[in-house]
Interface confidence: medium
């Protein structure tokens, strides 16, 4: 059962598994949600105790029955983990706490103009978990405007105290706001030296990487595969750190793999969710339950629905035995990982999918005007929307992309002559324009936000946001696309598609079925050569075939240039302008979304 409300002046008795310090009950609930075993918590506010050392304590709790006795206690705030809930969970905490000092190791001290600048510094520093900023009013002259970057072993403060004229807050890495490099490569036959901060068992290097990303102190990792010669170290995932933030030495080791935490690109790749099945593999751990089910998928479903289950092993049924039902062993451990991994046992193992909701919805796998394009199938481009105007008559105006449950990203030039958002309708989950009838449900537009530097498409800043009047419920046919991560500046996209209902040739009509075309990206230098009369800026991105034949065209404007990278679709471009349609040596020009990520986040999170 999902319980989101907080219980004031209530203390949950017993079940303690860990105590951390958090600046608020809300943050305590998030910490509990991300802890592998925490189901309930009690937070102690200032008024709950005479002893200031007990203030801001967040006691994480577990219970076999998923509940604990309630005791009245003034100042205590208790609640439940969001693990039991189906909504998306984020570790992102943008709150700034006034007159509080979160304690940790102060490893960097520098002057900053504002708390925001200090928070940005923390977000862009590989080691920083949280910061304290002494304001201009701070009594001690030499400490005014000082920004202290801090870290701890757990990522949470070692204590929190009241301190006048300071503010404190967390790194925004988990909000996808870091400018740190995002290194996605996994390096084969490589071990990184440097100190190990922890080790866990993992079935493959990708699970190891996700665990590293989720661990507050892990910056890079080394994974010893099943083929590793030393048996005791097989499937061992070493979580590592270094002072510089980079591995000091890489050692060639056959059957070892190494890579980096994805903490600075957390929102553009699945991080928490381990969805694969591991055949002929047993995960060892504390047994929670044994249930007879048909197949390993059913076993995973059972684990996902059992709130305390972290991983499972399915023992397939012996032939003609027990109506084809095998044994499903639901398991857990102190850290969420198997205590040992055994191969060659005939079992099929995997993890709960409960943590998938901690990933951005945009990373969920989807079903495996477009000149020279082909028709799409339903659910193929679930972020694509059709934007209609009702004035003077209803018609398709532009494309757009879902980037949040209340936000559509599109092109600014679509709104030439649009006086009011009232005449706009956004249709979501549509494949054929003919599906749109008078009674077809649509989303009204509350606000049109056009980039204030936009003048005309050809001179850039051709980007706009639509805030919807109501929120979108995500389904297989309507879900968001990921924005490119700022750490992805060096990614070379090779699998890019442009989609829309636009013209199939220069003089044509809007298409009924959503069209798609695979189009290669073109370098800006190459693009500039094709458009001598225009300035192709770094805020634009070009795509097209030298010989022409495939391109976006009238009616596709505002729609996405979607590129698949590491199995995740990213909104790389917004269809903006071009010379004709699909002309030889005239690539399409798109708004380079990466360059506007800050603008998008500023507007959508205001």
């Amino acid at each position: 059962e999902c319980v989101t409300r907080l219980f004031k002046d209530i203390h949950f008795e017993g079940g303690d598994i860990a105590t951390v310090f958090t600046p608020s009950a809300k943050h305590c609930q998030v910490v509990c949600t991300h802890h592998p075993r925490c189901l309930l918590f009690t937070f102690t506010g200032e008024s709950a105790s005479e002893d200031p050392t007990q203030w801001f304590t967040c006691v994480l709790k577990d219970s076999v029955t998923e509940t604990l006795p309630r005791v009245n206690r003034t100042g205590a705030i208790s609640g439940y983990s969001f693990k039991q809930c189906s909504h998306q969970i984020s570790a992102c905490n943008k709150d700034i706490y006034v007159d509080l000092n979160m304690k940790g190791i102060n490893y960097n001290s520098s002057l900053a103009e504002s708390a925001q600048e200090c928070q940005e510094r923390c977000t862009d520093d590989v080691h920083c978990h949280f910061f304290t900023y002494a304001t201009r009013q701070f009594p001690s002259l030499e400490h005014r405007n000082i920004c202290l970057l801090k870290h701890t072993q757990t990522g949470t403060p070692t204590g929190i105290m009241k301190l006048d004229k300071v503010v404190t807050g967390f790194s925004l890495k988990s909000c996808a706001l870091s400018n740190l490099a995002c290194i996605r490569d996994v390096f084969p036959n490589t071990a990184f030296a440097d100190s190990n901060i922890d080790s866990v068992m993992a079935p493959d290097a990708f699970v190891c990487r996700r665990i590293c990303t989720h661990h507050p102190g892990c910056l890079f990792f080394t994974f010893f595969s099943q083929e590793w010669p030393k048996e005791s170290q097989r499937n061992l995932c070493l979580l590592k750190t270094s002072e510089s933030g980079l591995p000091s030495t890489r050692i060639k080791k056959s059957k070892a793999l190494s890579g980096f935490s994805l903490q600075s690109c957390r929102h553009s790749i699945p991080v928490f969710c381990h969805s694969s099945f591991y055949h002929d593999t047993d995960f060892l751990g504390e047994e929670l339950d044994i249930v007879a089910v048909k197949g390993h998928e059913a076993c995973q479903k059972l684990c996902t629905n059992a709130v305390r289950c972290q991983f499972f092993t399915y023992a397939p049924a012996q032939a003609s035995c027990n109506e084809g039902k095998g044994k499903c062993y639901l398991k857990l451990s102190s850290n969420g990982s198997p205590t040992k991994i055994l191969r060659g046992t005939g079992g099929i193992s995997g993890y709960t999918l409960r943590l998938c909701k901690m990933d951005n919805e945009c990373t969920t796998k989807i079903k495996p005007r477009i000149v020279g394009g082909t028709a799409s199938v339903r659910g193929e481009w679930p972020w694509q929307v059709t934007l209609h105007t009702t004035s003077p008559t209803q018609r398709h105006l532009c494309g757009g992309s879902i980037i949040g449950n209340q936000w559509i990203l599109t092109a600014a030039h679509c709104f030439y002559g649009v006086e009011s958002p009232k005449i706009l309708r956004v249709y979501i989950g549509i494949l054929n324009q003919s599906e749109i009838k008078e009674d077809t449900s649509f989303f009204g537009v509350q606000e049109i936000i056009i980039h204030d530097q936009y003048k005309m498409a050809e001179s850039g800043y051709d980007i706009a946001l639509l805030k919807l009047e109501t929120t979108v419920n995500y389904t297989d046919s309507q879900r968001p696309i990921c924005l490119p991560s700022k750490g992805d500046r060096n990614v070379i996209y090779t699998d890019c598609w442009v989609t829309g209902w636009g013209y199939r040739k220069l003089r044509d009509k809007i298409q009924n079925t959503l069209q798609k075309a695979k189009i290669p990206l073109v370098t800006n230098d190459e693009c500039q050569k094709r458009y001598r009369g225009h300035k192709i800026t770094h805020k634009m991105i070009c795509a097209g075939y030298r010989e022409g034949g495939k391109d976006a065209c009238k009616g596709d404007s505002g729609g996405p240039l979607s590129c698949k990278h590491n199995e995740v679709w990213h909104l790389v471009g917004i269809t903006s302008w071009g010379e004709g349609c699909a002309q030889r040596e005239r690539p399409g020009v798109y708004t380079n979304v990466l360059e506007y990520v800050d603008w998008i986040l500023e507007k959508t999170q205001a």
């Epitope: 490099a181 290194i183 000091s248 030495t249 890489r250 050692i251 060639k252 060096n490």
Partner: antibody, heavy 119, light 108 residues
């Protein structure tokens, strides 16, 4: 064909700076790790610095740490070495080299550029 | 750091001779060892990678062997164009990347 061409060498006074460039052609520069290796007159080879294919990681040898900075511009297929606080010990032929194969071996080299540090 | 020691530091041989140059690592480097040839005024050229794999375009008279700490470069029948300086290099633990001090092969 695969080619690396260094430039920017010359005679410089101690304490001054110099920037070497290395222009790559004939291969996809942005896919590969690049290095600088130097050779002092009549002596052996000494590794100077390396940079990952995407510029995300950089390392340098102890003798140049804090003085030399390696960088790259993948859009221009060019590798750079910014050399500051030069001393007579930095006098050498500087080679730009890359690892384009699957093993960590320098399989592509430039012709080298001479740097002389002298007052 | 891993030290690489070559021997001999120089040697004289005649065309047609079989020549062996050795390289020793200060610790085990598995088979992560490369050999280079350098002629005066020229850049080094990769001959052998991963201890025994011949780089494409390199004549088959060059061969490499060894693993762990001891490695050998062999030229089975010396040709006039083979007179040069030869370097070994470890790529096991990097950075730093370390080279041997070189072996100068001269005409007798």
């Amino acid at each position: 064909q695969v080619q690396l061409v260094e430039s920017g060498g010359g005679v410089v006074q101690p304490g001054r700076s110099l920037r070497l460039s290395c222009a790559a052609s004939g291969f996809t520069f942005s896919n590969y790790e690049m290095h600088w290796v130097r050779q002092t007159p009549g002596k052996g080879l000494e590794w100077v610095a390396l940079i990952w294919y995407d510029g995300s990681n950089k390392y340098s040898g102890d003798s140049v740490k804090g003085r030399f900075t390696i960088s790259r511009d993948n859009s221009k297929s060019t590798l750079y070495l910014q050399m500051n606080s030069l001393t007579a010990e930095d006098t050498a032929v500087y080679y730009c080299t890359g690892i384009t194969g699957t093993e960590d071996a320098f399989d592509v080299w430039g012709q080298g550029t001479m740097v002389t540090v002298s007052s | 750091d891993i030290q690489m020691t070559q021997s001999p530091s120089s040697l004289s041989a005649s065309v047609g001779d079989r020549v062996t140059i050795t390289c020793r690592a200060s610790q085990s480097i598995s088979s992560y060892l490369n050999w280079y040839q350098q002629k005066p005024g020229k850049a080094p050229k990769l001959l052998i990678y991963a201890a025994s794999s011949l780089q494409s375009g390199v004549p088959s008279r060059f061969s490499g062997s060894g693993s762990g700490t001891d490695f050998t470069l062999t030229i089975s029948s010396l040709q006039p164009e083979d007179f040069a300086t030869y370097y070994c290099q470890q790529s096991y633990s990097t950075p730093p990347i370390t080279f041997g001090q070189g072996t100068r092969l001269e005409i007798k």
